[in-house]
Interface confidence: low
């Protein structure tokens, strides 16, 4: 009887020999095998010579086979896709002679320490190369010269300290480049050449911002909409650009794209561009203008964007340099913890965590003139903060409207830290309709750079903070008042703060409630008029750091009872990446915390 299962659902005969405790290739494979799955066996070594008679073989899967050596001593003329991922390969043989038709090569999650210069020679058809999660410390010059058709290159999660300057030369078809989570300090001048790369991942490296970074800085500014923060399980096309995810390891994690480069030479001889200092900073936000004729209300969509730390080997956690000494900050938040998850000590300091807030707000034409909500005392240049106060929860398996009040100001060219006091729990991201009252004033929605420093002056705001009482109820526990701080405004756009009471109901008593308090103070500015004009949609994306201090916890999951009738849609709430999963054990991919 045949060891493997056989099917022919396509024009190729597919043979599945996965997890059969094989130590060698089965002797009775069909001669016309086109797709061969050998994953999860104990092959140890593998030779392509064993497959030369399978002249239709197009896809070969050798993942998780405990491979320590691969011999390419047999030519597989038709093989297009080779999966060698999750093995123990420390080196790769020359592949081109044996696999001339190869279009996809996956050698991720191995132990490759280096690559020989000609390892890819002859792979003229290669379109996708996956080398992530290896031990690569450097790459040989000319490595990719033979692979002129390459479209996707993944070098993430290695130990690359530098890149050969001509690595991408001739790769005109390249559209996706993963370089996140390496030890890169800079990018060689001219590295990207004239390539147009729609999707580039560069975060979690040790970018060193000095005069040598200016080429890279300029490239980031020119390609701000093509730089992304990698998020596990999410297709790159479904994520939002985040150029601010590329940060200076030596400058308190300020974004590289906004590095001032003061005192650096600007002659074209030193760079691949003419004069860096003449280039204005690129905004950290992007604006999409959509025309509408029938929208009657403000609609605000919130979501936290981040890659959650998890036990996955490729969870994208921002790696901070060991020399980084961030300013201590505190935040208040409520966190949902699942049963069996690590219990936290009463007080704990985490590494700085980067948060990205995406605010998608549709402005509706209105003649209303909004009065200023506060003034800025001794303003820092070019810093116009935004106040956001929200109470949100997302209990598992429920769709719960939540009252929310929001005041936003977005002056031209402003740098907007987003201080927020919020209550939010969400074990699983879901779409939750939430009541809201929102006031948004926008002068130039298209320009909102992220601050390079988090230094803010804190004036006496005219908007008064008022206490909010929240009653927490659980089926099996006593009622416990939970103090929170909120800045609320009335639905009529007045700036008068009002006290609010929200009832918190807990369907499951299996979670942990944690308070964190932020010291970043809100500052509001500017009287703005929203004239009668075409509605526009503005997407603001902020990326900033905070350090968390955990306070005593309560076991509970919270649910807010709706009190208003307009709705805030919460399509996605995911956890933000932190330095390591160990440093913030309460941050898990299934959990969510709000800002800041």
């Amino acid at each position: 009887q045949h060891t493997c299962s056989i099917s022919k659902v396509t024009s190729l005969l597919e043979v599945n020999c996965e997890n059969k405790k094989l130590t060698a290739l089965p002797a009775d494979l069909p001669a016309d095998t086109g797709i061969l799955h050998l994953g999860e066996n104990q092959l140890g070594t593998f030779s392509t010579a064993s497959l030369v008679h399978f002249t239709h073989l197009t896809y070969l899967y050798l993942d998780r086979c405990e491979l320590t050596s691969l011999q390419t001593n047999g030519k597989l003329i038709k093989l297009e896709n080779l999966d060698l991922s999750h093995n123990n390969l420390k080196s790769l043989p020359s592949l081109g002679w044996a696999l001339p038709a190869l279009t996809t090569l996956d050698v991720s999650f191995n132990k490759l320490g280096s690559l020989s210069p000609g390892v890819l020679d002859g792979l003229s058809q290669l379109q996708e190369l996956y080398l992530q999660n290896n031990d690569l410390k450097s790459l040989p010059p000319g490595l990719l010269l033979p692979t002129t058709k390459l479209k996707k290159l993944n070098l993430a999660n290695n130990k690359l300290r530098e890149l050969p300057s001509g690595l991408l030369d001739g790769l005109e078809d390249l559209d996706t480049l993963y370089l996140q989570r390496n030890w890169l300090r800079t990018i060689p001048k001219g590295f990207f050449g004239t390539l147009l790369l729609p999707f580039v991942f560069l975060h979690a490296n040790s970018w060193y911002c000095d005069c040598e970074i200016l080429y890279f800085r300029h490239w980031l500014q020119e390609n701000a909409n093509n730089v992304y923060l990698w998020k596990q399980g999410v297709d790159v096309k479904d994520t939002t650009p985040n150029v601010a995810s590329v940060r200076c390891a030596n400058l308190d994690n300020a974004p590289v794209y906004s590095y001032p480069g003061k005192g650096c030479p600007t002659s074209s001889g030193d760079t691949d561009y003419d004069d860096y200092d003449d280039i204005p900073d690129v905004p950290a936000t992007r604006t999409e203008v959509k025309f509408s004729t029938n929208t009657k209300v403000h609609t605000t969509h919130w979501s936290l964007l981040a890659a959650a730390p998890s036990t996955s080997q490729d969870s994208q956690m921002i790696s901070l340099p060991p020399t980084h000494k961030p300013t201590k900050k505190q935040s208040t938040f409520i966190h949902t913890q699942s049963p069996g998850f690590t219990t936290l000590p009463e007080t704990m300091e985490s590494n700085p965590t980067f948060y990205s807030l995406k605010l998608n707000t549709v402005l509706i034409p209105s003649p209303t003139t909004l009065e200023p909500t506060s003034t800025q005392a001794t303003p820092e240049p070019n810093i116009q903060p935004m106040l956001t106060t929200s109470t949100l929860t997302t209990p598992e398996h429920s769709t719960t409207p939540v009252p929310t009040t929001t005041i936003l100001t977005t002056p031209e060219h402003s740098t907007i830290p987003v201080p927020t006091t919020a209550i939010l729990t969400t074990p699983k991201p879901s779409t939750i309709p939430v009541p809201t009252t929102a006031t948004l004033t926008t002068l130039e929605p298209s320009t909102t750079p992220v601050p390079t420093t988090a230094t803010l002056t804190t004036p006496e705001p005219s908007t008064t903070l008022v206490p909010t009482t929240a009653t927490l109820t659980t089926p099996e526990h006593s009622t416990t008042p939970v103090p929170t701080t909120a800045t609320l405004t009335t639905p009529e756009h007045s700036t008068t703060p009002v006290p609010t009471t929200a009832t918190l109901t807990t369907p499951e008593p299996s979670t942990t409630l944690t308070n964190l308090v932020s010291t970043i103070s809100p500052v509001l500015t500017t009287t703005l008029t929203t004239p009668e004009s075409t509605p526009i949609e503005t997407i603001l994306e902020q990326f900033f750091t905070t350090e968390l201090t955990l306070l005593p916890t309560l076991e509970s999951t919270t649910t807010i009872i709706p009190e208003q009738n307009s709705f805030l849609n919460l399509p996605e709430v995911a956890l933000v990446s932190s330095d390591t999963s160990e440093s913030s054990p309460f941050l898990n991919s299934d959990f969510c915390c709000f800002l800041p």
């Epitope: 030369v52 002249t55 197009t58 011999q71 390419t72 001593n73 047999g74 030519k75 003329i77 038709k78 297009e80 043989p93 020359s94 081109g96 002679w97 044996a98 001339p100 038709a101 279009t103 020989s116 000609g118 020679d121 002859g122 058809q125």
Partner: antibody, heavy 118, light 113 residues
Framework: QVQLVESGGGVVQPGRSLRLSCAAS????????MSWVRQAPGKGLEWVAS???????YYPDSVLGRFTISRDNSKNTLYLQMNSLRAEDTAVYYC????????????WGQGTLVTVSS | DIQMTQSPSSLSASVGDRVTITCKSS????????????LAWYQQKPGKAPKLLIY???TRESGVPSRFSGSGSGTDFTLTISSLQPEDFATYYC?????????FGQGTKVEIK
């Protein structure tokens, strides 16, 4: 220009061994895959062995385990070690350069005759 | 192994004639991904080494006169000499370089009529 010169052929008894050499010049030897192709008297061509630029050997079943192809890039020389020779191994042995990872042969030597006879 | 069969095994022709040699493979030599047929043609004169004429069915090796052309796809291939010249009298071999072991046809001898 590209030149391939074979040597080492001769008459040998069945079961004995012989080593052929091929001296290459006029191109960057280390960058090319090389092969041996033979032609029995009055017969057609038969591929015998190939070796990649990285040194990986490859054989047809007819010689597998008896013949060994190797190369010395420092000497620009290709070798074919032939053991357990049989009468049917009698042929002119050509050294040939393989083009660009595709196994067709763009340059050939003049050949060396190996006669296996008792 | 892929068997290669040439026809005719020999032919007589005169200078200026159009000569056609066919080669059949026991299985397709077409790589559907790149649409290339992995077939080469060689010319061999008595006492000499073979000389590459054509590879990938129709790509002429540099220095080969344009009167030599190749065509075909899948399992049926043709070498055409549009106007036979005195130096073209030789034996011609086809070779598949699609799947190992690389195999040759038995040869077609082109003689003077």
């Amino acid at each position: 220009q590209v030149q391939l010169v074979e040597s080492g052929g001769g008459v040998v008894q069945p079961g004995r061994s012989l080593r052929l050499s091929c001296a290459a010049s006029g191109f960057t030897f280390s960058s090319f895959a090389m092969s041996w192709v033979r032609q029995a008297p009055g017969k057609g061509l038969e591929w015998v062995a190939s070796i990649t630029s990285a040194g990986t050997p490859y054989y047809p079943d007819s010689v597998l385990g008896r013949f060994t192809i190797s190369r010395d890039n420092s000497k620009n020389t290709l070798y074919l070690q032939m053991n357990s020779l049989r009468a049917e191994d009698t042929a002119v042995y050509y050294c040939a350069r393989s083009r660009g990872y595709e196994d067709y042969f763009d340059y050939w030597g003049q050949g060396t005759l190996v006669t296996v006879s008792s | 192994d892929i068997q290669m069969t040439q026809s005719p095994s020999s032919l007589s022709a005169s200078v200026g004639d159009r000569v056609t040699i066919t080669c059949k493979s026991s299985q397709s030599l077409l790589n559907s991904r790149n649409q290339k047929n992995y077939l080469a043609w060689y010319q061999q004169k008595p006492g000499k080494a073979p000389k590459l004429l054509i590879y990938f069915t129709s790509t002429r090796e540099s220095g080969v006169p344009s009167r030599f052309s190749g065509s075909g796809s899948g399992t049926d291939f043709t070498l055409t000499i549009s106007s036979l010249q005195p130096e073209d009298f030789a034996t011609y071999y086809c070779q598949q370089h699609y799947s190992s072991p690389w195999t040759f046809g038995q040869g077609t001898k082109v003689e003077i009529k």
